[in-house]
Interface confidence: low
Protein backbone atom coordinates (compact mmCIF):
# COMPACT_ATOMS: atom_id res chain seq x y z
CA UNK A 1 0.00 0.00 0.00
CA UNK A 2 1.29 3.52 -0.69
CA UNK A 3 2.34 5.54 2.35
CA UNK A 4 -0.40 7.77 3.71
CA UNK A 5 -0.03 11.47 2.87
CA UNK A 6 -0.12 13.46 6.09
CA UNK A 7 -2.31 16.55 6.11
CA UNK A 8 -1.23 19.56 8.13
CA UNK A 9 -1.04 19.86 11.00
CA UNK A 10 0.76 16.63 11.74
CA UNK A 11 3.44 15.48 14.13
CA UNK A 12 6.67 14.84 12.27
CA UNK A 13 8.47 11.56 12.69
CA UNK A 14 11.39 11.83 15.12
CA UNK A 15 14.43 13.20 13.32
CA UNK A 16 12.53 14.09 10.15
CA UNK A 17 11.84 17.53 8.77
CA UNK A 18 8.62 19.16 7.72
CA UNK A 19 7.92 19.21 4.00
CA UNK A 20 8.43 22.06 1.57
CA UNK A 21 6.13 25.02 2.36
CA UNK A 22 5.60 23.79 5.91
CA UNK A 23 7.19 24.89 9.14
CA UNK A 24 7.63 23.33 12.54
CA UNK A 25 5.64 25.11 15.25
CA UNK A 26 7.44 24.66 18.55
CA UNK A 27 4.35 25.48 20.60
CA UNK A 28 2.04 23.09 18.80
CA UNK A 29 4.91 20.64 18.12
CA UNK A 30 3.40 20.08 14.69
CA UNK A 31 4.27 20.61 11.05
CA UNK A 32 1.98 23.37 9.81
CA UNK A 33 1.36 25.12 6.49
CA UNK A 34 3.24 28.26 5.59
CA UNK A 35 1.35 31.12 3.95
CA UNK A 36 2.02 31.89 0.30
CA UNK A 37 3.70 35.09 -0.91
CA UNK A 38 1.22 37.95 -0.61
CA UNK A 39 -0.27 36.46 2.56
CA UNK A 40 0.58 36.27 6.27
CA UNK A 41 -0.46 34.12 9.20
CA UNK A 42 -3.68 35.46 10.68
CA UNK A 43 -4.04 32.57 13.16
CA UNK A 44 -1.19 30.22 14.08
CA UNK A 45 -1.72 26.50 13.99
CA UNK A 46 -2.59 24.34 16.97
CA UNK A 47 -2.50 20.58 17.40
CA UNK A 48 -5.92 20.36 15.77
CA UNK A 49 -6.10 23.29 13.33
CA UNK A 50 -3.78 24.49 10.57
CA UNK A 51 -2.40 27.99 10.00
CA UNK A 52 -5.05 30.48 8.86
CA UNK A 53 -3.63 32.84 6.23
CA UNK A 54 -4.90 36.23 5.13
CA UNK A 55 -3.99 38.58 2.28
CA UNK A 56 -1.55 41.39 2.91
CA UNK A 57 -3.15 44.81 3.29
CA UNK A 58 -2.38 47.70 0.94
CA UNK A 59 1.24 48.91 1.05
CA UNK A 60 2.43 45.69 2.70
CA UNK A 61 3.93 42.54 1.26
CA UNK A 62 5.47 39.12 1.82
CA UNK A 63 7.84 37.89 -0.84
CA UNK A 64 8.38 34.33 0.40
CA UNK A 65 6.40 31.47 1.88
CA UNK A 66 6.13 32.55 5.50
CA UNK A 67 4.32 32.47 8.81
CA UNK A 68 4.77 36.07 9.94
CA UNK A 69 1.83 37.58 11.87
CA UNK A 70 1.92 40.82 9.84
CA UNK A 71 3.05 41.54 6.31
CA UNK A 72 6.09 43.76 5.88
CA UNK A 73 5.66 47.46 5.21
CA UNK A 74 6.61 48.55 1.72
CA UNK A 75 9.24 51.27 1.71
CA UNK A 76 8.31 54.94 1.49
CA UNK A 77 7.16 56.22 -1.87
CA UNK A 78 10.04 57.17 -4.12
CA UNK A 79 11.07 60.80 -3.86
CA UNK A 80 11.07 63.14 -6.84
CA UNK A 81 14.75 62.52 -7.62
CA UNK A 82 14.22 58.76 -7.72
CA UNK A 83 12.45 56.35 -10.02
CA UNK A 84 10.37 53.42 -8.92
CA UNK A 85 11.99 50.42 -10.60
CA UNK A 86 9.70 47.95 -8.85
CA UNK A 87 6.22 48.76 -7.57
CA UNK A 88 4.93 47.79 -4.14
CA UNK A 89 2.64 44.80 -4.54
CA UNK A 90 1.37 42.22 -2.07
CA UNK A 91 4.29 40.01 -3.10
CA UNK A 92 7.20 42.44 -3.47
CA UNK A 93 8.62 45.57 -1.92
CA UNK A 94 8.93 48.84 -3.77
CA UNK A 95 12.42 49.49 -5.14
CA UNK A 96 13.53 53.09 -5.61
CA UNK A 97 16.73 53.99 -7.43
CA UNK A 98 18.31 57.30 -8.24
CA UNK A 99 17.29 58.36 -11.71
CA UNK A 100 19.85 58.13 -14.54
CA UNK A 101 22.58 60.73 -14.21
CA UNK A 102 22.19 60.83 -10.43
CA UNK A 103 23.84 58.94 -7.57
CA UNK A 104 23.05 58.23 -3.91
CA UNK A 105 24.73 60.98 -1.88
CA UNK A 106 23.17 60.13 1.48
CA UNK A 107 22.05 56.61 2.22
CA UNK A 108 19.49 55.85 4.88
CA UNK A 109 18.93 52.46 6.45
CA UNK A 110 15.83 51.88 4.34
CA UNK A 111 17.47 52.97 1.08
CA UNK A 112 18.69 56.17 -0.48
CA UNK A 113 17.71 59.29 1.46
CA UNK A 114 19.21 61.80 -0.97
CA UNK A 115 20.04 61.49 -4.67
CA UNK A 116 22.36 64.06 -6.23
CA UNK A 117 23.19 64.77 -9.86
CA UNK A 118 26.46 63.33 -11.10
CA UNK A 119 29.19 65.95 -11.40
CA UNK A 120 29.84 67.18 -14.94
CA UNK A 121 33.46 67.71 -15.89
CA UNK A 122 33.88 71.09 -17.57
CA UNK A 123 35.96 71.68 -20.72
CA UNK A 124 39.61 70.99 -20.02
CA UNK A 125 38.68 68.22 -17.63
CA UNK A 126 37.69 64.61 -18.30
CA UNK A 127 36.19 61.80 -16.28
CA UNK A 128 38.88 60.06 -14.22
CA UNK A 129 36.47 57.81 -12.38
CA UNK A 130 32.90 57.29 -13.57
CA UNK A 131 30.00 57.75 -11.21
CA UNK A 132 28.47 54.71 -9.59
CA UNK A 133 25.24 54.04 -7.73
CA UNK A 134 26.78 55.52 -4.57
CA UNK A 135 29.72 57.68 -5.68
CA UNK A 136 30.10 60.85 -7.70
CA UNK A 137 32.12 61.32 -10.87
CA UNK A 138 35.78 62.26 -10.32
CA UNK A 139 37.19 64.75 -12.85
CA UNK A 140 40.84 65.27 -13.77
CA UNK A 141 42.60 67.93 -15.85
CA UNK A 142 43.34 66.75 -19.35
CA UNK A 143 47.04 65.86 -19.70
CA UNK A 144 49.21 67.44 -22.39
CA UNK A 145 48.23 66.04 -25.77
CA UNK A 146 44.63 65.41 -24.70
CA UNK A 147 41.49 67.53 -24.48
CA UNK A 148 37.85 67.63 -23.58
CA UNK A 149 35.63 70.31 -25.05
CA UNK A 150 32.40 69.18 -23.40
CA UNK A 151 30.64 69.62 -20.09
CA UNK A 152 29.87 66.00 -19.36
CA UNK A 153 29.62 63.36 -16.62
CA UNK A 154 30.81 60.64 -19.05
CA UNK A 155 33.37 62.10 -21.48
CA UNK A 156 37.04 61.34 -20.91
CA UNK A 157 40.02 63.34 -22.16
CA UNK A 158 40.71 62.43 -25.80
CA UNK A 159 43.98 62.69 -27.71
CA UNK A 160 44.47 65.67 -30.01
CA UNK A 161 44.26 64.81 -33.66
CA UNK A 162 47.66 64.63 -35.34
CA UNK A 163 48.03 67.04 -38.23
CA UNK A 164 50.46 67.15 -41.16
CA UNK A 165 50.40 70.90 -40.66
CA UNK A 166 48.94 72.40 -37.50
CA UNK A 167 46.83 75.52 -37.96
CA UNK A 168 45.97 75.96 -34.27
CA UNK A 169 47.66 73.84 -31.60
CA UNK A 170 45.35 71.92 -29.34
CA UNK A 171 45.04 72.65 -25.63
CA UNK A 172 43.25 70.99 -22.69
CA UNK A 173 39.84 72.21 -23.85
CA UNK A 174 40.23 72.23 -27.63
CA UNK A 175 41.38 69.82 -30.28
CA UNK A 176 44.20 70.73 -32.61
CA UNK A 177 43.07 72.41 -35.83
CA UNK A 178 44.79 71.18 -38.98
CA UNK A 179 45.34 73.11 -42.17
CA UNK A 180 43.07 72.24 -45.08
CA UNK A 181 45.10 69.11 -45.79
CA UNK A 182 43.49 66.27 -43.91
CA UNK A 183 45.06 64.95 -40.73
CA UNK A 184 47.17 61.82 -40.96
CA UNK A 185 45.20 60.21 -38.20
CA UNK A 186 42.30 61.05 -35.96
CA UNK A 187 42.65 59.31 -32.62
CA UNK A 188 39.09 59.70 -31.51
CA UNK A 189 36.66 61.46 -33.79
CA UNK A 190 33.67 60.95 -31.52
CA UNK A 191 33.17 61.55 -27.83
CA UNK A 192 34.06 58.54 -25.71
CA UNK A 193 31.22 57.62 -23.34
CA UNK A 194 31.77 55.62 -20.22
CA UNK A 195 29.02 53.17 -19.31
CA UNK A 196 26.40 54.62 -16.94
CA UNK A 197 26.09 52.82 -13.62
CA UNK A 198 22.88 50.87 -13.21
CA UNK A 199 21.39 51.30 -9.76
CA UNK A 200 19.90 48.23 -8.15
CA UNK A 201 19.56 49.52 -4.63
CA UNK A 202 16.41 48.45 -2.82
CA UNK A 203 14.51 50.62 -0.37
CA UNK A 204 15.12 48.00 2.30
CA UNK A 205 18.38 46.17 2.74
CA UNK A 206 16.35 43.47 4.44
CA UNK A 207 12.59 42.95 4.75
CA UNK A 208 11.49 45.24 7.57
CA UNK A 209 8.50 44.51 9.78
CA UNK A 210 5.68 47.03 10.10
CA UNK A 211 5.68 48.50 13.64
CA UNK A 212 4.47 45.41 15.43
CA UNK A 213 5.56 42.55 17.57
CA UNK A 214 6.47 40.59 14.46
CA UNK A 215 9.14 37.95 14.89
CA UNK A 216 12.56 38.18 13.28
CA UNK A 217 12.49 38.45 9.52
CA UNK A 218 14.59 35.29 9.50
CA UNK A 219 11.13 33.66 9.58
CA UNK A 220 10.94 34.54 5.91
CA UNK A 221 13.67 32.13 4.88
CA UNK A 222 12.53 29.87 2.07
CA UNK A 223 12.98 26.74 4.17
CA UNK A 224 11.48 26.74 7.66
CA UNK A 225 13.34 25.42 10.70
CA UNK A 226 13.16 21.68 11.27
CA UNK A 227 11.93 20.06 14.43
CA UNK A 228 14.69 18.91 16.77
CA UNK A 229 16.21 15.59 15.82
CA UNK A 230 15.57 12.63 18.07
CA UNK A 231 17.63 12.80 21.23
CA UNK A 232 18.36 16.52 20.85
CA UNK A 233 16.99 19.30 23.01
CA UNK A 234 14.68 21.83 21.39
CA UNK A 235 14.87 25.57 21.95
Amino acid sequence: LPAQVAFTPYAPEPGSTCRLREYYDQTAQMCCSKCSPGQHAKVFCTKTSDTVCDSCEDSTYTQLWNWVPECLSCGSRCSSDQVETQACTREQNRICTCRPGWYCALSKQEGCRLCAPLRKCRPGFGVARPGTETSDVVCKPCAPGTFSNTTSSTDICRPHQICNVVAIPGNASMDAVCTSTSPTRSMAPGAVHLPQPVSTRSQHTQPTPEPSTAPSTSFLLPMGPSPPAEGSTGD
Epitope: S73, G75, S76, R77, C78, S79, S80, L106, K108, Q109, E110, R113, L114, Q203, T205, Q206, P207, T208, P209, E210, P211, T213, A214, P215, S216, T217, S218
Partner: antibody, heavy 117, light 111 residues
Protein backbone atom coordinates in the same frame (compact mmCIF):
# COMPACT_ATOMS: atom_id res chain seq x y z
CA UNK B 1 7.17 41.65 21.69
CA UNK B 2 9.44 44.46 20.55
CA UNK B 3 11.25 46.00 23.52
CA UNK B 4 13.99 48.57 24.01
CA UNK B 5 15.46 48.38 27.50
CA UNK B 6 17.78 51.16 28.67
CA UNK B 7 20.33 51.30 31.48
CA UNK B 8 19.49 52.93 34.78
CA UNK B 9 19.71 56.56 35.99
CA UNK B 10 23.10 58.24 36.29
CA UNK B 11 24.36 61.01 38.57
CA UNK B 12 27.55 62.62 37.29
CA UNK B 13 29.75 65.59 38.05
CA UNK B 14 30.45 68.29 35.45
CA UNK B 15 33.32 67.27 33.17
CA UNK B 16 32.71 63.54 33.63
CA UNK B 17 31.48 61.10 30.97
CA UNK B 18 28.47 58.79 30.86
CA UNK B 19 27.49 55.86 28.65
CA UNK B 20 23.83 54.91 28.28
CA UNK B 21 22.89 51.52 26.81
CA UNK B 22 19.79 50.41 24.92
CA UNK B 23 19.12 46.72 24.30
CA UNK B 24 16.67 45.77 21.56
CA UNK B 25 14.69 42.53 21.56
CA UNK B 26 11.68 41.00 19.83
CA UNK B 27 12.89 41.92 16.35
CA UNK B 28 16.02 41.62 14.23
CA UNK B 29 18.18 44.39 15.71
CA UNK B 30 20.06 45.09 12.48
CA UNK B 31 16.88 45.52 10.41
CA UNK B 32 16.26 49.09 11.57
CA UNK B 33 18.24 52.12 12.65
CA UNK B 34 18.33 53.30 16.26
CA UNK B 35 17.54 56.92 17.09
CA UNK B 36 18.25 58.96 20.23
CA UNK B 37 15.99 61.66 21.66
CA UNK B 38 16.68 64.04 24.56
CA UNK B 39 14.12 65.58 26.90
CA UNK B 40 15.35 68.13 29.42
CA UNK B 41 13.24 68.55 32.61
CA UNK B 42 9.91 70.18 31.73
CA UNK B 43 10.96 70.59 28.11
CA UNK B 44 10.04 69.09 24.75
CA UNK B 45 11.60 66.35 22.66
CA UNK B 46 14.88 66.95 20.80
CA UNK B 47 16.01 64.52 18.11
CA UNK B 48 19.73 63.90 18.61
CA UNK B 49 20.37 61.66 15.62
CA UNK B 50 20.50 57.99 14.73
CA UNK B 51 22.91 55.15 14.01
CA UNK B 52 22.74 52.67 11.14
CA UNK B 53 22.72 49.29 12.85
CA UNK B 54 24.07 47.53 9.76
CA UNK B 55 27.05 49.77 9.03
CA UNK B 56 27.56 51.47 12.42
CA UNK B 57 27.50 54.87 10.70
CA UNK B 58 26.10 57.61 12.96
CA UNK B 59 24.23 60.79 12.01
CA UNK B 60 24.20 63.65 14.53
CA UNK B 61 21.90 66.66 14.61
CA UNK B 62 23.92 69.91 14.69
CA UNK B 63 23.40 70.52 18.42
CA UNK B 64 24.79 67.08 19.22
CA UNK B 65 28.02 67.08 17.23
CA UNK B 66 31.22 66.78 19.26
CA UNK B 67 30.60 65.50 22.76
CA UNK B 68 27.98 62.89 21.82
CA UNK B 69 28.89 59.50 20.36
CA UNK B 70 26.54 56.74 19.16
CA UNK B 71 27.93 53.20 19.00
CA UNK B 72 26.76 49.59 18.74
CA UNK B 73 27.45 46.06 19.86
CA UNK B 74 25.29 44.07 17.45
CA UNK B 75 26.37 40.78 19.05
CA UNK B 76 24.22 41.72 22.05
CA UNK B 77 21.68 43.85 20.09
CA UNK B 78 22.68 46.96 22.01
CA UNK B 79 23.13 50.61 21.05
CA UNK B 80 25.07 53.07 23.20
CA UNK B 81 25.08 56.82 23.73
CA UNK B 82 28.23 58.28 25.27
CA UNK B 83 28.39 61.90 26.43
CA UNK B 84 31.75 63.38 27.41
CA UNK B 85 32.66 66.61 29.22
CA UNK B 86 29.23 66.68 30.86
CA UNK B 87 27.61 70.04 31.58
CA UNK B 88 24.69 70.94 33.85
CA UNK B 89 22.56 71.56 30.73
CA UNK B 90 23.02 67.91 29.71
CA UNK B 91 20.70 66.96 32.58
CA UNK B 92 17.82 65.23 30.82
CA UNK B 93 16.04 61.99 30.08
CA UNK B 94 17.64 60.27 27.08
CA UNK B 95 15.48 57.90 25.03
CA UNK B 96 16.53 55.38 22.44
CA UNK B 97 13.94 54.78 19.75
CA UNK B 98 13.59 52.40 16.83
CA UNK B 99 13.87 54.29 13.56
CA UNK B 100 11.19 52.63 11.41
CA UNK B 101 10.34 54.04 7.96
CA UNK B 102 6.93 55.02 9.35
CA UNK B 103 8.35 56.83 12.38
CA UNK B 104 9.86 56.34 15.83
CA UNK B 105 7.66 53.36 16.61
CA UNK B 106 9.16 51.86 19.79
CA UNK B 107 10.87 53.77 22.60
CA UNK B 108 13.06 52.74 25.51
CA UNK B 109 11.88 53.62 29.01
CA UNK B 110 14.34 56.53 29.15
CA UNK B 111 17.51 57.09 31.15
CA UNK B 112 17.75 60.11 33.44
CA UNK B 113 21.22 61.63 33.41
CA UNK B 114 21.72 64.22 36.16
CA UNK B 115 24.81 66.45 36.04
CA UNK B 116 25.44 68.22 39.32
CA UNK B 117 28.44 69.24 41.39
CA UNK C 1 16.98 72.19 8.71
CA UNK C 2 13.19 72.05 8.64
CA UNK C 3 11.67 74.03 11.54
CA UNK C 4 8.45 72.74 13.12
CA UNK C 5 6.04 75.04 14.98
CA UNK C 6 3.03 73.86 16.99
CA UNK C 7 0.10 75.85 18.31
CA UNK C 8 -1.27 76.36 20.79
CA UNK C 9 1.44 75.57 23.35
CA UNK C 10 -1.29 74.52 25.78
CA UNK C 11 -5.06 74.23 25.88
CA UNK C 12 -7.78 73.33 28.35
CA UNK C 13 -11.02 71.72 27.21
CA UNK C 14 -13.96 69.83 28.65
CA UNK C 15 -14.56 66.09 28.34
CA UNK C 16 -16.37 65.48 25.05
CA UNK C 17 -15.00 68.62 23.38
CA UNK C 18 -13.43 68.58 19.94
CA UNK C 19 -9.77 69.53 20.22
CA UNK C 20 -7.53 70.69 17.35
CA UNK C 21 -3.75 71.12 17.39
CA UNK C 22 -1.90 72.63 14.44
CA UNK C 23 1.62 72.03 13.23
CA UNK C 24 3.41 74.15 10.62
CA UNK C 25 6.71 73.22 8.97
CA UNK C 26 9.14 75.77 7.51
CA UNK C 27 9.16 73.93 4.18
CA UNK C 28 7.07 71.23 2.59
CA UNK C 29 7.48 67.75 4.05
CA UNK C 30 5.72 66.15 1.07
CA UNK C 31 7.50 63.76 -1.26
CA UNK C 32 5.61 62.30 -4.22
CA UNK C 33 2.25 63.02 -2.58
CA UNK C 34 3.13 61.60 0.84
CA UNK C 35 3.47 63.89 3.86
CA UNK C 36 6.28 62.81 6.19
CA UNK C 37 4.70 64.22 9.34
CA UNK C 38 4.17 62.11 12.48
CA UNK C 39 2.34 62.73 15.76
CA UNK C 40 3.32 61.44 19.22
CA UNK C 41 1.52 61.50 22.57
CA UNK C 42 3.37 61.78 25.88
CA UNK C 43 1.34 61.36 29.05
CA UNK C 44 2.75 62.90 32.25
CA UNK C 45 5.77 60.94 33.49
CA UNK C 46 5.50 58.45 30.63
CA UNK C 47 7.39 57.54 27.47
CA UNK C 48 6.24 59.14 24.18
CA UNK C 49 3.86 56.99 22.16
CA UNK C 50 3.67 56.89 18.35
CA UNK C 51 0.13 57.94 17.31
CA UNK C 52 -0.04 58.87 13.63
CA UNK C 53 2.31 58.42 10.69
CA UNK C 54 2.39 60.10 7.29
CA UNK C 55 0.02 62.86 8.47
CA UNK C 56 -3.19 60.83 8.64
CA UNK C 57 -2.47 57.13 9.25
CA UNK C 58 -3.44 55.94 12.72
CA UNK C 59 -1.10 53.44 14.33
CA UNK C 60 -2.94 50.23 15.18
CA UNK C 61 -4.46 50.36 18.66
CA UNK C 62 -4.90 54.14 18.64
CA UNK C 63 -8.54 55.13 19.34
CA UNK C 64 -10.47 56.36 16.30
CA UNK C 65 -11.31 59.65 18.01
CA UNK C 66 -7.77 60.70 17.01
CA UNK C 67 -7.28 61.83 13.42
CA UNK C 68 -4.61 63.65 11.46
CA UNK C 69 -4.87 65.74 8.30
CA UNK C 70 -2.93 68.17 6.17
CA UNK C 71 -0.21 68.25 3.55
CA UNK C 72 2.72 70.39 2.48
CA UNK C 73 3.45 72.63 5.45
CA UNK C 74 0.15 72.74 7.38
CA UNK C 75 -1.04 69.84 9.52
CA UNK C 76 -3.72 69.20 12.14
CA UNK C 77 -4.24 66.64 14.91
CA UNK C 78 -7.88 66.39 16.00
CA UNK C 79 -9.40 64.65 19.01
CA UNK C 80 -13.08 64.42 18.13
CA UNK C 81 -14.29 63.85 21.68
CA UNK C 82 -11.76 64.56 24.44
CA UNK C 83 -11.47 61.87 27.11
CA UNK C 84 -9.78 62.11 30.53
CA UNK C 85 -7.09 59.64 29.39
CA UNK C 86 -6.13 62.03 26.55
CA UNK C 87 -4.47 64.43 29.00
CA UNK C 88 -0.94 64.57 27.58
CA UNK C 89 1.52 66.62 25.58
CA UNK C 90 1.29 66.06 21.83
CA UNK C 91 4.26 66.49 19.51
CA UNK C 92 4.45 66.62 15.74
CA UNK C 93 7.67 65.57 14.02
CA UNK C 94 8.84 65.88 10.44
CA UNK C 95 10.50 62.80 8.97
CA UNK C 96 11.07 64.25 5.50
CA UNK C 97 14.81 64.61 6.02
CA UNK C 98 17.63 64.40 8.53
CA UNK C 99 17.73 65.90 11.02
CA UNK C 100 14.25 64.91 12.13
CA UNK C 101 12.73 67.81 14.06
CA UNK C 102 9.92 67.97 16.63
CA UNK C 103 7.45 70.71 17.36
CA UNK C 104 7.71 72.24 20.83
CA UNK C 105 4.64 70.32 22.02
CA UNK C 106 1.01 71.12 22.92
CA UNK C 107 -0.12 70.36 26.47
CA UNK C 108 -3.77 69.24 26.62
CA UNK C 109 -5.59 69.48 29.95
CA UNK C 110 -9.18 68.90 31.14
CA UNK C 111 -11.16 71.88 32.43
Amino acid sequence: EVQLVQSGPELKKPGASVKVSCKGSGYTFTDLGMGWVRQAPGQGLEWMGWINTQTGEPFYADDFKGRFVFSLDTSVSTAYLQISSLKAEDTAVYYCTRDHPLGLDYWGQGTLVTVSS
Amino acid sequence: DIQVTQSPSSLSASVGDRVTITCITSQSVDVAGVSYLNWYQQKPGKVPKFLIHKASNLRSGVPSRFSGSGSGTDFTLTISSLQPEDVATYYCQQAREDPYTFGQGTKVEIK
